[in-house]
């Protein structure tokens, strides 16, 4: 058993049918010595008396808010949560496996640049009685500071019969140098509590591996005289790291017909302009990627050919 | 239709072209190592990230773009002295800092070159003959060093008398390639920045 926060405790249980559970001793936070009784949650049934209460915690029915009283007055509370270990592996009931980029990906994180700021998000089908708390650091043995905000509900989607909820959090490394070569990964730890169930999820990454630039901005077309060709131009996104000559991007320019089945023409360039043939009803899209370290491509920025 | 990227004119800054080749070569070598050594811990998540140049060179600090020198988090610089004549210095106005930067890059390359050559000698003794260093990568390191053209003491190739542990050598190769790829990215950024300046 360990303390999650003041008066909230997590009991770790080896979870299998007929498991013996864990013996837990609760102590009433009071100078009083006698006349103390204990109850669980809203029930008025007295579970025991005395300054300490010994309970065998086996299932969720044994978890909850234990309260010690004296003469009708509440003295203190202890909330017991359960953390299930199923065959040597901690349970992952609360969050959905996003399966991207690989199986068992519960937390996904992205950064728009090398400033040390990043966003993480996760999915759940649970709508109520749910709380998250996020901590982060650079490295784990001698951790350096990363400050995270509060997790917020950022999107709701309907997936088949189920509603899916997306939560996200923004974090910022306290003293980040955009040009630094990372040798210690960023660690992100999310504590999730649903009713009386506690779970924790972690992710470990280098900022360089989670970079996803914003799409190029100011995408414009300039028709070339006496030709079906157009000059496409764009600019680096505002959120990208500067100077751009150091933090360079490479671009992919795509000409896509109205129908998804039509052949796509693609050109790769390090410049912020390209000459392409603009077909009727087609659209021109441009996306960006770090020129030297192949992390994710940005989303597409698009303009119609007409 | 995937069109290759046109190589920029290297005339103004000859090192840019070489540094791009270096990044390509080390990335290819790392990919090959990860595929060939699939039963070894060779992914970024599995290895320890060690920097063999740590406390010996200070490339990141010495090559910091001017715009980032205002960022206090970037100024954890270390005092290191370097030789300051090099053929990549296209203009006489080149600052002492730029000379320091390029000589730091040169020292990095020299250190990695020695490590890779020592390692290759060990890998050639492996009866499994599982993996060797790409000669192209070694050649590209050499070309960039020549383009930088710094006079510096030659570091003798390390030789070891004990029987090599091939498992450890292959893991060390992965560690080295990951670190060198990161340094090659920094070198490319620096060359691109200097080229634009």
């Amino acid at each position: 058993i360990w303390e999650l926060k003041k008066d909230v405790y997590v009991v770790e249980l080896d979870w299998y049918p007929d498991a013996p559970g864990e013996m837990v001793v609760l102590t009433c936070d009071t100078p009083e010595e006698d006349g103390i009784t204990w109850t669980l949650d809203q029930s008025s049934e007295v579970l025991g008396s005395g300054k300490t209460l010994t309970i065998q915690v086996k299932e969720f029915g044994d978890a909850g808010q234990y309260t010690c009283h004296k003469g009708g007055e509440v003295l203190s509370h202890s909330l017991l949560l359960l953390h299930k270990k199923e065959d040597g592996i901690w349970s992952t009931d609360i969050l959905k496996d996003q399966k991207e980029p690989k199986n068992k990906t519960f937390l996904r994180c992205e950064a728009k640049n090398y400033s040390g700021r990043f966003t993480c998000w996760w999915l759940t089908t649970i709508s109520t009685d749910l709380t998250f708390s996020v901590k982060s650091s650079r490295g784990s043995s001698d951790p350096q500071g990363v400050t995270c905000g509060a997790a917020t509900l950022s999107a709701e989607r309907v997936r088949g019969d189920n509603k899916e909820y997306e939560y996200s959090v923004e974090c910022q490394e306290d003293s980040a140098c955009p040009a630094a070569e990372e040798s210690l990964p960023i660690e992100v730890m999310v504590d999730a509590v649903h009713k009386l169930k506690y779970e924790n999820y972690t992710s470990s990454f280098f900022i360089r591996d989670i970079i996803k630039p914003d799409p190029p901005k100011n995408l414009q077309l300039k028709p070339l005289k006496n030709s079906r060709q157009v000059e496409v131009s764009w600019e680096y996104p505002d959120t990208w790291s500067t100077p751009h000559s150091y933090f360079s991007l490479t671009f992919c320019v795509q000409v896509q017909g109205k129908s998804k089945r039509e052949k796509k023409d693609r050109v790769f360039t390090d410049k912020t302009s390209a000459t392409v043939i603009c077909r009727k009803n087609a659209s021109i899209s441009v996306r960006a990627q770090d020129r030297y370290y192949s992390s994710s491509w940005s989303e597409w920025a698009s303009v119609p050919c007409s | 239709r995937n069109l290759p990227v046109a190589t920029p004119d290297p005339g103004m800054f000859p090192c840019l072209h070489h540094s791009q080749n270096l990044l390509r070569a080390v990335s290819n070598m790392l990919q090959k190592a990860r595929q060939t050594l699939e039963f070894y811990p060779c992914t970024s998540e599995e290895i320890d990230h060690e920097d063999i140049t740590k406390d010996k060179t200070s490339t990141v600090e010495a090559c910091l773009p001017l715009e980032l020198t205002k960022n206090e988090s970037c100024l954890n610089s270390r005092e290191t002295s370097f030789i300051t004549n090099g053929s990549c210095l296209a203009s006489r106005k080149t600052s002492f800092m730029m000379a320091l930067c390029l000589s730091s890059i040169y020292e990095d390359l020299k250190m990695y070159q020695v490590e890779f050559k020592t390692m290759n000698a060990k890998l050639l003794m492996d009866p499994k003959r599982q993996i060797f260093l790409d000669q192209n990568m070694l050649a590209v390191i050499d070309e960039l060093m020549q383009a930088l053209n710094f006079n510096s003491e030659t570091v003798p190739q390390k030789s070891s008398l004990e029987e090599p542990d091939f498992y450890k050598t292959k893991i060390k190769l992965c560690i080295l390639l990951h670190a060198f790829r990161i340094r090659a990215v920094t070198i490319d950024r620096v060359m691109s920045y200097l080229n634009a300046s």
């Epitope: 007929d18 065959d87 | 039963f39």
Partner: antibody, heavy 115, light 112 residues
Framework: QVQLVQSGGGVVQPGRSLRLSCAAS????????MHWVRQAPGKGLEWVAF????????YYADSVKGRFTISRDNSKNTLYLQMKSLRAEDTAVYYC????????WGQGTMVTVSS | SYVLTQPPSVSGTPGQRVTISCSGG????????VKWYQQLPGTAPKLLIY???QRPSGVPDRFSGSKSGTSASLAITGVQAEDEADYYC????????????FGTGTKVTVLG
């Protein structure tokens, strides 16, 4: 006393369907994940499928994906395996089993797929 | 396809020490716990070892398990006639959990 009692096995023709049941008693069935494991005659153990305690997630072996469906009725304390498009290679003893460091197995039920 | 490899058979005379190996990889045994089962003819498997080296109550102490890196082993010190059975190791793969990964199985024969 934890008990898992299996039923529903038998002889079936290729291409036909069969449903296996596993009745649980002696524990809070709705709190635990459950597996199906099979063993072809003279062969080793092969995992077939898993279902979470609340039925929210199901996982299948590639060899049965799209043909077999694992389900549970927590109000009846029963686990099911619906097998469709049966093949000769599905012939095996099928076991249900609890998920956890200490597990309990059903007695097994024989499924024979033969024309 | 079995990812955990066991020897097809091992044998010993009563009182001898018999060991069965179970070889896997970094993503399974290297990252997860190992169990061992005993299966007597015509019966369901019985748990012998859980979490690499733990014995459930009721399992004789002549059975012991260990794990090192990407391999595990089961030892029977002082093998007895009633130990003649098939033995299976089981683990998980970090990418496909909760799918159970079973070893190929080992037939233990007690001679004499």
């Amino acid at each position: 006393q934890v008990q898992l009692v299996q039923s529903g096995g038998g002889v079936v023709q290729p291409g036909r369907s069969l449903r296996l049941s596993c009745a649980a008693s002696g524990f809070t069935f709705s709190s635990y994940g459950m597996h199906w494991v099979r063993q072809a005659p003279g062969k080793g153990l092969e995992w077939v499928a898993f279902i979470r305690y609340d039925g929210s997630n199901k996982y299948y072996a590639d060899s049965v994906k799209g043909r077999f469906t694992i389900s549970r009725d927590n109000s009846k304390n029963t686990l099911y395996l619906q097998m469709k498009s049966l093949r000769a290679e599905d012939t095996a003893v099928y076991y249900c089993k609890t998920h956890g460091s200490h597990d309990n197995w059903g007695q097994g039920t024989m499924v024979t797929v033969s024309s | 396809s079995y990812v955990l490899t066991q020897p097809p058979s091992v044998s010993g005379t009563p009182g001898q020490r018999v060991t069965i190996s179970c070889s896997g990889g970094r993503s399974n045994i290297g990252s997860n716990t190992v169990k061992w089962y005993q299966q007597l003819p015509g019966t369901a498997p019985k748990l012998l070892i859980y979490v690499n080296d733990q014995r459930p109550s009721g399992v004789p102490d002549r059975f012991s398990g260990s794990k090192s890196g990407t391999s595990a082993s089961l030892a029977i010190t002082g093998v007895q006639a009633e130990d003649e059975a098939d033995y299976y190791c089981q683990s998980y793969d970090r990418g496909t959990h909760p799918a159970l990964l079973f070893g190929t199985g080992t037939k233990v024969t007690v001679l004499g």
